[in-house]
């Protein structure tokens, strides 16, 4: 079953290569277990950035080596992606699945265009 997912159109990463955005889904029921996946689309290629599952009201659990962190509040997921460089600029799509209880719902956002600008190196001081 389909579900609506909303996310901001554009986000500018900080000078430290950190970008945060909110992924909000219109839950048709009372989900207790949710899976969130962030995918990057660039040059028609789609790659998985990170994925997490969480029980409603709990922290998101990403893999240990994940560049993502996040928190949840109701039907909102606050996602933060770290370690971004200019080459990581692209469309970051939020995918939400309501895993339990049945029925299973799937929603895919339109994507957040994240712009990353590498900081200029500091000039040497004499």
């Amino acid at each position: 079953k389909a579900m609506h997912v909303a996310q901001p159109a554009v986000v500018l990463a900080s000078s430290r290569g950190i970008a945060s955005f909110v992924c909000e889904y219109a839950s048709p029921g009372k989900a207790t277990e949710v899976r969130v996946t962030v995918l990057r689309q660039a040059d028609s290629q789609v790659t998985e950035v990170c994925a997490a599952t969480y029980m409603m009201g709990n922290e998101l659990t990403f893999l240990d080596d994940s560049i993502c962190t996040g928190t949840s509040s109701g039907n909102q997921v606050n996602l933060t992606i770290q370690g971004l460089r200019a080459m990581d600029t692209g469309l970051y799509i939020c995918k939400v699945e309501l895993m339990y209880p049945p029925p299973y719902y799937l929603g895919i956002g339109n994507g957040t265009q994240i712009y990353v600008i590498d900081p200029e190196p500091c000039p040497d001081s004499d």
Epitope: Q41, V46, E48, A51, L106, I108
Partner: nanobody, 119 residues
Framework: EVQLVESGGGLVQAGGSLRLSCAAS????????MGWFRQAPGKEQEFVAD????????YYADSVKGRFTISRDNAKNTVYLQMNSLKPEDTATYYC????????????WGQGTQVTVSS
């Protein structure tokens, strides 16, 4: 056109095992993910398990965790569901599904295979 064909269903006693297979045909392709869903008469569709190609990462519904194992053979474009310690509540039609890319959703579905667990 991609086709998914399931097999391996049947009637089994509680505590028994079955191995479902889902073969994809119709071309050479690399799926982002393949999974299994089930639906019992009069009940909502339930997610069972899936596996994502990128890292071979698997995910299971709590109701089957520790009893079911999903695996895939990329060379054969086939995904398997090994079901052990079956319970009467596992009785349902099991459907295989595949998604081409992570942002396409479950693009392709099989016709389903019936699993009946008697007590």
């Amino acid at each position: 056109e991609v086709q998914l064909v399931e097999s391996g269903g049947g009637l089994v006693q509680a505590g028994g095992s079955l191995r479902l297979s889902c073969a994809a045909s119709g071309g050479t392709f690399s799926f982002y993910g393949m999974g299994w869903f089930r639906q019992a008469p009069g009940k909502e569709q339930e997610f069972v398990a899936d596996i994502r190609t990128s890292a071979g990462r698997t995910y299971y519904a709590d109701s089957v965790k520790g009893r079911f194992t999903i695996s895939r053979d990329n060379a054969k474009n086939t995904v398997y569901l090994q079901m052990n310690s079956l319970k009467p509540e596992d009785t349902a039609t099991y459907y295989c599904a595949a998604e081409m890319s992570g942002i396409s959703g479950w693009d392709y579905w099989g016709q389903g295979t019936q699993v009946t667990v008697s007590s």
